[in-house]
């Protein structure tokens, strides 16, 4: 009788993570009597995957009934495969021995490769906001994929970006891999509604790439432009001065009126109007009673936007240009929350 051979017909097997791997093995003879064991790897550090006689292997099932007399099929199934299961599996015939069975013959091995999907890409922007014309960096990370080949692209509002650097780690063989990419984006004033997208394509995704997004609204700061104007006289002794705060983002804004350098009133932007590009406009006004003033008044609109240093715009109010009101009405005519009487 010809000596037993252990046949592993599949040189390699490719399985998706979470699925069941079937590792095939047959023997050409029942002789000698003794069990089959499966190992991952070879040599002294090999890992026992299944022992027909001893131990508990909850993830492993046999394809056929190994207790049947004429069974020569020693194939196994390993359930719930993860990237950590990748490696070369050997079907090894042992012959009975004491105290341990004696290794008799090994199959040639089957390499198990695990296809694992990349995790959803996570895009993160800079820690601090930046203003238009500045270049900011965005990072994209995805983990746990296998095999190593992967494609990553960056887009801004659907337009592919070219200024980025990508690394896949580790460089050598591994059960799974991670990708890290950094893209440079130049901000424009119109970017409040813009999105940066990181797109990852991998064999496991069957042509349906994963995307991670970052809204530039989280990154951009558009500083306001200020315009202070004097409106036509509402009454003989009153002047309406407005401060138009235009095209700012984000909304967080505090406005202070100064009269001749002294704080007159401070308010926070509340009822703003939104522009099509996502920036905001806001207007504050003062109703100035000029009757009490003998000298010209310098009115300053000072704006602190998003915690940045204040910007201001001033307007000189010529008191002499307006006739003094007869009588002594010094009370403010507060017809709106933004009206202010000058004493």
């Amino acid at each position: 009788e010809e000596e037993l051979q252990v046949i592993q017909p599949d040189k390699s097997v490719l399985v998706a993570a979470g699925e069941t791997a079937t590792l095939r093995c047959t023997a050409t003879s029942l002789i000698p009597v003794g069990p089959i064991q499966w190992f991952r790897g070879a040599g002294p550090g090999r890992e026992l995957i299944y022992n027909q006689k001893e131990g508990h292997f909850p993830r492993v099932t046999t394809v056929s009934d190994l207790t049947k007399r004429n069974n020569m099929d020693f194939s196994i199934r390993i359930g719930n495969i993860t990237p950590a299961d990748a490696g070369t599996y050997y079907c090894v015939k042992f012959r009975k021995g004491s105290p341990d069975d004696v290794e008799f013959k090994s199959g040639a091995g089957t390499e198990l490769s695990v296809r694992a999907k990349p995790s959803a890409p996570v895009v993160s922007g800079p820690a601090a906001r930046a203003t238009p014309q500045h270049t900011v960096s965005f990072t994209c990370e995805s983990h746990g994929f296998s095999p190593r080949d992967i494609t990553l692209k960056w887009f801004k509002n659907g337009n592919e970006l070219s200024d980025f650097q990508t690394n896949v780690d580790p460089v050598g063989e591994s059960v799974s891999y991670s990708i890290h990419s950094t893209a440079k984006v130049v901000l424009t004033r119109e970017d409040v509604h813009s999105q940066v997208i990181c797109e990852v394509a991998h064999v496991t995704l069957q042509g349906d790439p994963l995307r991670g997004t970052a809204n530039l609204s989280e990154t951009i700061r558009v500083p306001p432009t200020l315009e202070v104007t004097q409106q036509p006289v509402r009454a003989e002794n009153q002047v309406n001065v407005t401060c138009q705060v235009r095209k700012f983002y984000p909304q967080r804004l505090q406005l202070t009126w100064l009269e001749n350098g002294n704080v007159s009133r401070t308010e926070t932007a509340s009822t703003v109007t939104e522009n099509k590009d996502g920036t905001y406009n806001w207007m504050s006004w003062l109703l100035v009673n000029v009757s009490a003033h003998r000298d010209d008044v310098k009115l300053t609109c000072q704006v602190e936007h998003d915690g940045q240093p204040a910007v201001s715009k001033s307007h000189d109010l010529k008191v002499s240009a307006h006739p003094k009101e007869q009588g002594s009405n010094t009370a403010a005519e507060n017809t709106g929350s933004n009206e202010r009487n000058i004493y």
């Epitope: 002789i31 009597v33 001893e54 207790t67 007399r69 009975k96 004491s98």
Partner: antibody, heavy 120, light 107 residues
Framework: QVQLVQSGAEVKKPGASVKVSCKAS????????MHWVRQAPGQRLEWMGY????????KYNEKFKGRVTITRDTSASTAYMELSSLRSEDTAVYYC?????????????WGQGTTVTVSS | DIQMTQSPSSLSASVGDRVTITCKAS??????VAWYQQKPGKVPKLLIY???YRYTGVPSRFSGSGSGTDFTLTISSLQPEDVATYYC?????????FGGGTKVEIK
């Protein structure tokens, strides 16, 4: 290490029954098959039957069918052989012996033997 | 049942001699034959299984051969501790059956 320890010697009258135990240790009891083999004085070894503790499957030598019953208690890792309707020619040393499979009849470990004497 | 006929039933040989014991099966048992050694007052001990595979711990002077119906156990150089009765057994089909034994003694 693997050990099969059998119960002590028995003296029985013809027509009686005897039950011999075999306690296994040092291996997974349910992974191997337990056989019973006897050896009458000056006679060849004689296989009586087996039990597969994994599935409680049994097989008996036709010669003893109806008289021999092999059972097991997996929680105690113990196999039992009961022989009924004893006659003088049943006087023998009874061994339990282990094999790898129910289709494998080569026995790598043996118990120390239990002498059963049938005498009126 | 398959009959196993062993010969000789006994033999006496000198230390260092080559000893051969034969066993004949009444029908083809492929290579499903085992050999056991039983010393006086002791339990049988497995020497060879599947006709030619030496069990672990068994000295290399013991070897088995044969297939089909004719099988041989050879002790290449008899030692004093080899004094025992040797049994062949077929493990091809139930009921497993044993030969009558060969008693080996030292001259």
């Amino acid at each position: 290490q693997v050990q099969l320890v059998q119960s002590g010697a028995e003296v029985k009258k013809p027509g009686a029954s005897v039950k011999v135990s075999c306690k296994a240790s040092g291996y997974t009891f349910t992974s191997y098959v337990m056989h019973w083999v006897r050896q009458a004085p000056g006679q060849r070894l004689e296989w009586m039957g087996y039990i597969n503790p994994y599935n409680d499957g049994t097989k008996y030598n036709e010669k003893f069918k109806g008289r021999v019953t092999i059972t097991r208690d997996t929680s105690a890792s113990t196999a039992y052989m009961e022989l009924s309707s004893l006659r003088s020619e049943d006087t023998a040393v009874y061994y339990c012996a282990r094999s790898y499979y129910d289709y494998d009849g080569s026995f790598d470990y043996w118990g120390q033997g239990t002498t059963v004497t049938v005498s009126s | 049942d398959i009959q196993m006929t062993q010969s000789p039933s006994s033999l006496s040989a000198s230390v260092g001699d080559r000893v051969t014991i034969t066993c004949k099966a009444s029908q083809d048992v492929t290579t499903a034959v085992a050999w056991y050694q039983q010393k006086p007052g002791k339990v049988p001990k497995l020497l060879i299984y599947s006709a030619s595979y030496r069990y672990t711990g068994v000295p290399s002077r013991f070897s088995g051969s044969g297939s089909g119906t004719d099988f041989t156990l050879t002790i290449s150089s008899l030692q004093p501790e080899d004094v025992a009765t040797y049994y062949c057994q077929q493990h091809y089909s139930t009921p497993w059956t044993f030969g009558g034994g060969t008693k080996v003694e030292i001259k």
